[in-house]
């Protein structure tokens, strides 16, 4: 999915409160240098003691329409022998991001800002042990 300029019948930025209606240039500038990008790990999802998988979350009425989301592979963590450690838990690390969602009941190319919670990876934490008093 993509954003394209609003038609003439849609409200323009000048006619409304600036914060309610703004024009956004969606050309993405990759600010990461080649060196920084090449160091970005793509194998941590397998090497981690709390490994995860990635799924391609698609929503044509959202910008960006494609977001890769992490899910922990196991409830427990993986020890040095490759076995699940029942004293340690895999937990999802989530990040709140801003996305643009199309407002279908209005002009077809009118979008609103929405918050979205996205899983970015998993980490290993010790299980909570409750001692009987």
């Amino acid at each position: 999915a993509v954003l394209i300029p609003q038609s003439s019948v849609c409200p323009n930025a000048e006619a409304n409160n600036f914060l309610q209606n703004v024009k956004v240039n969606l050309k993405v500038i990759n600010s990461l240098s080649s060196k920084a990008s090449s160091r970005r790990p793509s194998d941590y999802l397998n090497r981690s003691t709390s490994p995860w998988t990635l799924s391609r979350n698609e929503d044509p009425d959202r910008y960006p329409s494609v977001i890769w989301e992490a899910q922990c592979r196991h409830q427990r963590c993986v020890n040095a022998e490759g076995k699940l450690d029942h004293h340690m838990n895999s937990v999802l690390i989530q990040q709140e991001i801003l996305v643009l969602k199309r407002e279908p009941e209005k002009c077809p190319f009118t979008f609103r800002v929405e918050k979205m919670l996205v899983g970015v990876g998993c980490t290993c934490v010790s299980s909570i042990v409750r001692h009987a008093s």
Epitope: A1, V2, S38, L45, N46, T53, L54, R56, E58, V66
Partner: antibody
Framework: EVQLVQSGAEVKKPGASVKVSCKAS????????FHWVRQAPGQGLEWIGV????????AYNQNFRDRATLTADKSTSTAYMELSSLRSEDTAVYYC????????????WGQGTLVTVSS | NIVMTQSPATLSVSPGERATLSCKAS??????VGWFQQKPGQSPRLLIY???NRYTGVPARFSGSGSGTDFTLTISSLQPEDFAVYFC?????????FGQGTKLEIK
């Protein structure tokens, strides 16, 4: 200049596997998705799946989920598509193509790799 | 899966004339449609993205229109190098699908 260069033609027997490579140059390899598409002789194009070299994520067309494996090697900026349990109907030209995830379109394509499955 | 249906399968037009190629989606795909040109032995070449945006370096005689389920590729004045197969494709939702192609031949 962006270039996607694929490996050479392959001839395989039914039941075998084939691994096609696609080497990228002219841009940051980890920034964009790689999709794989095939075209049987005289036919249309069929989407196989996608890999994002930046995070290692993959997604597949259900028709290929059990037989196709997509991988990427960041050190050589190369994407791979492996297809197993080959049958005669897998004879096709296999293309890698770069997908601009934010913009939402395929811009550059490899030159294609002809895979022939014959006994 | 979304089915993309192109018509006609073959179109015979004389050089200098206008060619109009059609593509229909089995359900709404908004404007998430691309058009590709393919010549024998070559890879597909992107012409139009998002239904109506001409890709960098594509001549102005190529134009696209449509939204929802009906899309059109128009070549205003056919040049000898335009005779090829043209595919439409949707990237609205995966699995991304392509039309079967329209072969544009010299009349």
């Amino acid at each position: 200049e962006v270039q996607l260069v694929q490996s050479g033609a392959e001839v395989k027997k039914p039941g075998a596997s084939v691994k096609v490579s696609c080497k990228a140059s002219g841009y940051t390899f980890t920034d964009y998705e790689f999709h794989w598409v095939r075209q049987a002789p005289g036919q249309g194009l069929e989407w196989i799946g996608v890999i994002h070299p930046g995070n290692g994520g993959t997604a597949y067309n259900q028709n290929f989920r059990d037989r196709a494996t997509l991988t990427a090697d960041k050190s050589t900026s190369t994407a791979y598509m492996e297809l197993s349990s080959l049958r005669s109907e897998d004879t096709a030209v296999y293309y890698c193509t770069r997908f601009l995830t934010y913009e939402g379109y395929f811009d550059y394509w490899g030159q294609g790799t002809l895979v022939t499955v014959s006994s | 899966n979304i089915v993309m249906t192109q018509s006609p399968a073959t179109l015979s037009v004389s050089p200098g004339e206008r060619a109009t190629l059609s593509c229909k989606a089995s359900q709404s795909v908004s404007i998430d449609v691309g058009w590709f040109q393919q010549k024998p032995g070559q890879s597909p070449r992107l012409l139009i993205y998002h239904a109506s945006n001409r890709y960098t370096g594509v001549p102005a005689r190529f134009s696209g229109s449509g939204s929802g389920t009906d899309f059109t590729l128009t070549i205003s004045s056919l040049q000898p190098e335009d005779f090829a197969v043209y595919f439409c494709q949707q990237d609205y939702s995966s699995p991304y699908t392509f039309g079967q192609g329209t072969k544009l031949e010299i009349k």
